[in-house]
């Protein structure tokens, strides 16, 4: 469960991937297509509002409370429009709805690698928000290797 | 109740080399990093660097990367550190620490070993 | 690396006075500023995350606040038992940061 319903905190702040391209969305034929891309010198970057929540981690659902929180953020690149993982399709996609947000909505926030960000899904743990074939798609992390793998890592730069 | 049990204190030459431990129980070990802090007396917080459970992966303070080594036993859920070439300036109490939250260092630390003294001393 | 300056380094106050420490971090941290208390022989122990939440045991005289850059830890009605060094640590970026510390003592 969510501890309560309003954010710890927000932030505005642009998100490029680790090889520093950057990710911008576009509406095409009245949907947002994501895109991962180099970018122009002279070109804006796009800005998403991260939302941070603050969440039991199902590992501790019986304990006292006080262990096993976890830190959650919901992406959202314009108004009522949220980053959403499909783990049937492995893809990443951008949703207009409503809130509450569904949980498909919501990702458990790692940091450390290299200044970097990783999104875990909250809906499949062990599945992160990663780069394939210059486009957003979720990725089965395999934490007998290092979590630090390139293609999950992004920069969030204001 | 989560715990972190430290190894006890060690009185060492300078030059040589001490492997201290932090033993944790109360929460699935693999879960969290676990980080080293190195307060020398009288003085503040220093964070050393911590490793990742899951993988052995290891990050580390530019400022102690010559001077420690991180390693795990996960069948026992013990961490160990290494301090090698030991000078006067190595005499501190250190502390193992878990963060507040699974995954990130927001939250800051919520748990803490009662640290290991090492007394480097001809 | 975010340096985290911290202010006063020492302070001497009156039980049940208010008290003030400020912890300025050289670049923004958003919320990500944590505070610690420290008793003497002892380890340090979480009052405040996310610059305004208060850990779980902590007495609510203990206030947190800030975001950004500059960050403040104020203890209201000063108890005996809050006779204690006080440091901020910032969580943002690696290497993890911590302030100087301020040493509280009984005027």
């Known amino acids: 469960s969510i501890t309560g319903i309003s954010p710890i905190t927000e932030s505005l702040a642009s998100l490029s991937t680790y090889n520093d391209q950057s990710i911008t969305f576009a509406l095409e034929d009245e949907s947002y297509e994501i895109y991962v891309e180099d970018l122009k010198k002279d070109k804006k970057k796009d800005k998403v509002l991260l939302s941070y929540y603050e969440s039991q981690h199902p590992s501790s659902e019986s304990g006292d409370g006080v262990d096993g929180k976890m830190l959650m953020v919901t992406l959202s690149p314009t108004k009522d429009f949220w980053l959403q993982a499909n783990n049937k399709e492995h893809s990443v996609e951008l949703h207009k709805c409503e809130k509450p947000l569904p949980d498909q909505a919501f990702f458990v926030l790692h940091n450390r690698s290299f200044n970097c960000v990783s999104f875990e899904c909250k809906t499949d743990p062990g599945v992160f928000i990663g780069v394939k074939d210059n486009h957003l798609a979720l990725i089965k992390v395999d934490y007998s290797e290092n979590l630090g793998s390139e293609n999950i890592l992004f920069k969030l730069s204001e | 109740e989560v715990l972190l049990q430290q190894s006890g204190p060690e009185l060492v030459k300078p030059g040589a080399s001490v492997k201290i431990s932090c033993n944790a129980s109360?929460?699935?070990?693999?879960?969290?990093?676990m980080n080293w802090v190195k307060q020398s007396h009288g003085k503040s917080l220093e964070s050393i660097g911590d490793?990742?459970?899951?993988?052995?992966?290891?990050f580390y303070n530019q400022n102690f990367k010559d001077k420690a080594t991180l390693t795990i036993d996960k069948s026992s859920s013990t961490v160990y550190m290494e301090l090698r070439s030991l000078t006067s300036e190595d005499t501190a109490m250190y502390y193992c620490a878990r963060h507040y939250y699974y995954g990130s260092s927001y939250g800051g630390f919520v748990y803490w070993g009662q640290g290991t003294l090492v007394t480097v001393a001809a | 690396d975010i340096q985290m300056n911290q202010s006063p380094s020492s302070l001497s106050a009156s039980l049940g006075d208010t008290i003030t420490i400020t912890c300025h971090a050289s670049q923004n941290i958003n919320v990500w500023l944590s505070w610690y208390q420290q008793k003497a022989g002892n380890n340090p122990k979480l009052l405040i995350y996310a610059a305004s939440k208060l850990h779980t045991g902590v007495p609510s005289r203990f206030t947190g606040s800030g975001s950004g850059t500059l960050f403040t830890l104020t203890i209201s009605s000063l108890q005996p038992e809050d006779i204690a060094t006080y440091y901020c640590?910032?969580?943002?970026?690696?290497?993890?940061?911590f302030g100087s510390g301020t040493n509280l003592e009984l005027k």
């Open positions: 640590q910032q969580g943002q970026s690696y290497p993890l940061t």
């Open positions: 109360g929460y699935t070990f693999s879960d969290y990093n």
């Open positions: 490793i990742n459970p899951k993988n052995g992966d290891t």
